[in-house]
Amino acid sequence: AVNGTSQFTCFYNSRANISCVWSQDGALQDTSCQVHAWPDRRRWNQTCELLPVSQASWACNLILGAPDSQKLTTVDIVTLRVLCREGVRWRVMAIQDFKPFENLRLMAPISLQVVHVETHRCNISWEISQASHYFERHLEFEARTLSPGHTWEEAPLLTLKQKQEWICLETLTPDTQYEFQVRVKPLQGEFTTWSPWSQPLAFRTKPAALGKDT
């Protein structure tokens, strides 16, 4: 598969985790591969075993320390290598000079909760998880609400262009079940991407009061 297309993509969660995916056309499913991380200015190095996630794709997480510890900074460069076993030896398949803060993907927001719900409105809050203090307020969010009879893909995206960990949903239908998700992205980084969507938060609007015009 030397001439096949391969891809090695890694993201830093801004604290103590680098998640990597390695894919290669024609590679065997039972191939044993690893990712090695060698920072240019740190005393530690780290390895993780790539595990199959699809036909020709493997993934692993480089755990650099305690979840909320700040293991890398904007000046760090980490040389990442994919090594695969060929017989008795390890063969280097790919190498990347990885700039952590150019390749960010944060953890999904957590602790979603309904702060206040009415017939047509719902106020929801959330928290960000394992996000670096370096960002200060330089984060943005996207949110979406699942209405009855629709899919997540059909849900319009609501953009919050600042670090605002709450939203007030309006023009909702009374006595109706909804679901809500949010995701986060730092403004920094050439290859930075959105976090995964949060776990959905289910909520129901209050019924319209009897005899009242809604």
Epitope: V2, N3, S6, Q7, F8, I95, Q96, D97
Partner: nanobody, 123 residues
């Protein structure tokens, strides 16, 4: 866009040496990792060597390991391939290529390509 211009090819006797150069230019060039490939007449293009721009980490084809050395000069945006112990089977058109982030042995992983420089090794 990124422009890659190879130079340094020529005719050399078996056992001799050559140094190929690849100069990178263009507004889009941004510390891209670089590689060398070669294509002999009637054969597929094959990987020779590659280097990451920042750390200088290298990859080699088994057929050239110990004989060829890839290096780069950051100040000149240039990558070199020092070839020694040349063999007739090293005769080929040598291409320089740039990848966006990662060096591998697969030609499809490289985005930008030069026009090539001819290396001929006589026996």
């Amino acid at each position: 866009q990124v422009q890659l211009v190879e130079s340094g090819g020529g005719l050399v006797e078996a056992g001799g040496s050559l140094r190929l150069s690849c100069a990178a230019s263009g507004r889009a060039f941004n510390n891209f990792p670089m590689g060398w490939f070669r294509q002999a007449p009637g054969k597929e293009r094959e990987f020779v060597a590659a280097i990451t721009w920042i750390s200088g980490s290298t990859l080699y084809a088994d057929s050239v390991k110990g004989r060829f050395t890839i290096s780069r000069d950051k100040s000149k945006n240039t990558v070199y391939l020092q070839m020694s112990g040349l063999k007739p089977e090293d005769t080929a058109l040598y291409y320089c290529a740039a990848a966006l982030k990662t060096i591998t042995r697969g030609q499809h992983d490289y985005t930008y390509w030069g026009q090539g420089t001819q290396v001929t090794v006589s026996s």
